[in-house]
């Protein structure tokens, strides 16, 4: 066996099963689980007299383990006095030794209760620059009690002095506080509240939680886009679950249809996000007709981890049907950006909410990552609008200055789409009866100003423009219009876009 | 249970081609990693192929090192080799959705000297 | 680069004590974190996934711990069996990486 240090346990009385007239009076110390021999033990009795007697030895059977206990007998005004037992082990180290100090007698007590309670993060959910931990040692029978703090199991140096103790009725409580640094608690270590008391140790600890609570496992299932039902003629549905947590458990996702009729071969794929977490898709094929018709379809999620399967189901949206508006704008020329120019387009008061936005150049339609859409929003009234945003360069403009944005919708007739043109130099690109006629005259400065109208995204015209005021109940829709350079000596120059 | 053979000793420059063979589960549902081993060093990752036969090499191994797969094997092609290149090649089971290696082979020693 | 840095190299323990290493990532992994045991002349074991979860198994004395680039193995109670080489290994990304694998820390029982 290897060298093994000693525990160390006082042995007493209960204090209320000593005769009190007793002259005398036999305390204890047991040491056990060393290994190899010898311990020695010694006693401290302060200012009485004592004899001590240390038994031999015996052999702990399963371990091969040594255990002995070392008593001593004192006589006089024991009953106020604490005693140490000292006890040694040498093969473990030279300097190796436990002190247990401890009264003649222990008393019936109520142990107390330790808990380390934080104070809270700020309002937006973020650690203060100090955090403060707080222990509370509740419930006890009055009596001398030690509270250390330890930060990962090592001991801190903290200032006791502040911790304060109140009576209630037959038992105590004492609190204790530790103010650590943001940097400290964000290191994740371990806090503890260690509280000695009646020779016993009671503690409690407390570390930062981890940054993203586990949350439950969801699952969502998309609708086919309408540019993949009604241009592509290939429509599929998509099921989504996330926050899975990492297991060796499969996640399954089985495909149903509602008449019972057998479903296409899906694809699945499986994708680690950084919150620790891992998304899982699976992609169906649907047919057009089928979706159209008003076909259901079902995906069954199942997972060992889940308690039960999820099930999600989808099917074309009911309700009243509306096509879409389309609106599309350029945005003026902006200093410092000759060379880029963003067009914007409005799509509205259309139902259902389902909509596929294309922007074309060319005849050609550009990738989706060119052009930012959101989210379709619902109207004051009962339909739906979207905003899409698109930049384009000068090489592109000079090419062919005419820019398509395109909705699909299923309410748009006659083929399901809507579409409006738009060009970054309206006057240049053969003068639009708009950039004919005289504006109304209000000046437009480049920062905004109460009562002046402001340009779509926030640009402005050229700072020493006069814009049209649009129309007199301003703000109104946004109109186009023309603004007129108005510097004495130049060349003057257009520029139609919004105020 | 895998096991890796085509270990040997070959001199710099020599192709070499090393096998796993896989028993008890479908590879067709797991990706499959190779890890090597220089004496008394570290683990090494080289590559994995995943279920769908898409492969994936450590920055290092791009190009002198090839991992391909059939219904029950996964091949490791070794070409360039330098004595730097001895080691224990190891080939393991990778499950994507824990981000770990569950099960390995025993590795199969290959050593590079002229 | 998901590259992963782990200390210490080598670390002596008595028997009972407890062990602490510490894996470090090049950038956030969240928790795909796996922790290996590796003895001579044997493959390397897994013990621990997802940062924090025990392989069936492994004994309850092997704690994992950490999140985003920061994570620690601790091995309390250390027995003659813990003898070995321990290796983490980033979970997250199968591209764009060097080694995904630490460079292993020895653990030596006394």
């Known amino acids: 066996a290897s060298t093994q240090s000693p525990s160390v346990f006082p042995l007493t009385r209960c204090c209320k099963n000593i005769p009190s007239n007793a002259t005398s009076v036999t305390l204890g110390c047991l040491a056990t689980g060393y290994f190899p021999e010898p311990v020695m033990v010694t006693w401290d009795t302060g200012s009485l007299n004592g004899t001590t007697m240390t038994l031999p030895a015996t052999t702990l059977t399963l371990s091969g383990h040594y255990a002995t206990i070392s008593l001593l007998t004192v006589s006089g005004a024991w009953a106020k006095q604490m005693f140490t037992c000292r006890v040694a082990h040498t093969p473990s180290s030279t300097d190796w030794v436990d002190n247990k100090t401890f009264s003649v007698c222990s008393r019936d007590f109520t142990p107390p209760t330790v808990k380390i309670l934080q104070s809270s993060c700020d309002g937006g959910g973020h650690f203060p620059p100090t955090i403060q931990l707080l222990c509370l040692v509740s419930g006890y029978t009055p009596g001398t009690i030690n509270i250390t703090w330890l930060e990962d199991g090592q001991v801190m140096d903290v200032d006791l002095s502040t911790a304060s103790t109140t009576q209630e009725g037959e038992l105590a409580s004492t609190q204790s506080e530790l103010t650590l640094s943001q940097k400290h608690w964000l290191s994740d270590r371990t806090y503890t509240c260690q509280v000695t008391y009646q020779g016993h140790t009671f503690e409690d600890s407390t570390k930062k939680c981890a940054d993203s609570n586990p949350r439950g496992v969801s699952a969502y299932l998309s609708r086919p886009s309408p540019f993949d039902l009604f241009i592509r003629k290939s429509p599929t549905i998509t099921c989504l679950v996330v926050d899975l947590a990492p297991s060796k458990g499969t996640v399954n996702l089985t495909w149903s249809r509602a008449s019972g009729k057998p479903v296409n071969h899906s694809t699945r794929k499986e994708e680690k996000q950084r919150n620790g977490t891992l998304t899982v898709t699976s992609t169906l094929p649907v047919g057009t007709r089928d979706w159209i018709e008003g076909e259901t379809y079902q995906c069954r999620v199942t997972h060992p981890h889940l308690p039960r399967a999820l099930m999600r189901s989808t099917t074309k949206t009911s309700g009243p049907r509306a096509a879409p508006e389309v609106y599309a704008f350029a945005t003026p020329e902006w200093p410092g950006s000759r060379d880029k120019r963003t067009l914007a387009c409005l799509i509205q008061n259309f139902m259902p909410e389902d909509i596929s936005v294309q922007w074309l150049h060319n005849e050609v339609q550009l990738p989706d990552a060119r052009h930012s859409t959101t989210q379709p929003r619902k109207t004051k009234g009962s339909g739906f609008f979207v905003f899409s945003r698109l930049e384009v360069t000068r090489a592109e403009w000079e090419q062919k200055d005419e820019f398509i944005c395109r909705a699909v919708h299923e309410a748009a007739s006659p083929s399901q789409t809507v579409q409006r043109a738009v060009s970054v130099n309206p006057g240049l690109a053969g003068g639009s009866a708009q950039s004919q006629r005289a504006p109304d005259r209000v000046l437009c400065h480049s920062g905004q100003q109460q009562g002046l109208p402001r340009a779509a995204g926030g640009s402005v015209p050229h700072p020493r423009c006069h814009c049209g005021a649009g129309r007199a109940d301003w703000p109104g829709p946004p109109e186009l219009d023309v603004c007129v350079e108005e510097a004495e000596g130049e060349a003057p120059w257009t520029w139609t876009g919004l105020c | 249970s895998l096991e890796e053979s085509g270990g040997r000793l070959v001199t710099p420059g020599t192709p070499l081609t090393l096998t796993c063979t896989a028993s008890?589960?479908?590879?067709?549902?797991?990706?499959m990693s190779w890890v090597r081993q220089a004496p008394g060093k570290g683990l090494e990752w080289i590559g994995v192929?995943?279920?769908?036969?898409n492969t994936y090499y450590a920055s290092w191994a791009k190009g002198r090192f090839t991992v391909s797969k059939t219904s029950t094997t996964v091949d490791l092609n070794l070409t360039s080799l330098t004595t730097e290149d001895t080691a224990t090649y190891f080939c393991?089971?990778?499950?994507?959705?824990?981000?770990?290696?569950?099960?390995w082979g025993p590795g199969t020693l290959v050593t590079v000297s002229s | 680069a998901y590259d992963m840095t782990q200390t210490p190299a080598s670390v002596e323990v008595a028997v009972g004590g407890t062990v602490t290493i510490k894996c470090q990532a090049s950038?956030?992994?969240?928790?795909?974190l796996a922790w290996y045991q590796q003895k001579p002349g044997q493959p390397p074991k897994e013990l621990i996934y997802?940062?924090?979860t025990l392989e069936s198994g492994v004994p309850s004395r092997f704690i994992g711990s950490g999140s985003g680039t920061e994570f620690t193995l601790t091995i309390s109670g250390v027995e003659c069996a813990d003898a070995a080489t321990y290796y983490c290994?980033?979970?997250?990304?199968?591209?764009?990486?060097?080694?995904?694998f630490g460079g292993g820390t020895e653990v030596v029982v006394k």
């Open positions: 290994q980033q979970g997250y990304s199968e591209d764009n990486i060097d080694n995904a």
């Open positions: 008890g589960f479908s590879l067709s549902s797991y990706h």
């Open positions: 393991a089971r990778y499950v994507f959705s824990s981000g770990s290696h569950d099960i």
């Open positions: 950038q956030s992994i969240g928790s795909w």
């Open positions: 192929i995943n279920s769908a036969g």
């Open positions: 997802g940062t924090s």
